[in-house]
Amino acid sequence: LGCDLPQNHGLLSRNTLVLLHQMRRISPFLCLKDRRDFRFPQEMVKGSQLQKAHVMSVLHEMLQQIFSLFHTERSSAAWNMTLLDQLHTGLHQQLQHLETCLLQVVGEGESAGAISSPALTLRRYFQGIRVYLKEKKYSDCAWEVVRMEIMKSLFLSTNMQERLRSKDRDLGSS
């Protein structure tokens, strides 16, 4: 079945969600009017026919984009530095795991299209988030909306990873 995502990858993803939750600085109840439809490409994570290359590519691009988003001067000014450092470290570890897996999957001949297409879609999605933050002048509420949006999209992506893992288990036991 090719590269198995390291067993602790799912744990790292959950830790990232926990960290994002802990990073909350203001009550989201103050920010209702700042909600925005970022149009997360749900079709990318909802399919039942999950290819390993696709799943890994989506997760890799998601984590890369989250890392970039939270690795800026603006982000450093907005968040608790201790939690931000922990987030960076966790994301870096996950990215290393995924890069190893992606190289192996590509080496096994899975289509490059399965890898490049999600990346482009996700870059557009994250660009929309960056534009929103700039429009809102990087306000506390804008960052809070973005934090919750990232938690949602990461949660959906992690679910996709879990579905792939359980599919692999089913195939392995049959």
Partner: antibody, heavy 121, light 107 residues
Amino acid sequence: EVQLVQSGAEVKKPGESLKISCKGSGYSFTSYWIGWVRQMPGKGLEWMGIIDPSDSDTAYSPSFQGQVTISADKSISTAYLQWSSLKASDTAMYYCARHPGLNWAPDFDYWGQGTLVTVSS
Amino acid sequence: DIQMTQSPSSLSASVGDRVTITCRASQSITGFLNWYQQKPGKAPKLLIYAASSLQSGVPSRFSGSGSGTDFTLTISSLQPEDFATYYCQQSHDFPLTFGQGTKVEIK
């Protein structure tokens, strides 16, 4: 299948305390807020307050602040609405409903079946 | 608090009629407006969110429009099951507030 199941009807006397519940299933309970809405007999809908079950942060309508307490136990995916001293004017149907928080999604897309609270001496 | 005013408070119509209900906010709520349908003894049901987005599973005869302070719910061709009370609700800011309701009755 997403469901919000509320506790059964209650008949109470003025001055008594009460806690009604709303149990969520079929979705990630901590990813949505839970709101409470009152409907007095023959009247319209009134928003009472809301809770974020992930950390129990709450917001109340000024009309209900200090009159009721909203809480949640995320370990059992349940939100609560409670009164320490009921009044006859609390007689109403109470609904819970889920809210997507700051995420862009339909507001109050799923509702509980309602809990009828009757307060009478 | 943001006040929501619905009109009319009740209306009589026949099956097949086009029905329009309006909702006015006391200040701009941009597009943060929802419409609900409630039948006697039942919980409210979400029809339209974000002023014009049709909730999944809701028939396309229901539509919503408007932004800022003035909003409209339209039922293009009233069906027997549409006789109910309709509420608008703003979700622009806390406290969330509902309109007083519009009862749609059979003529």
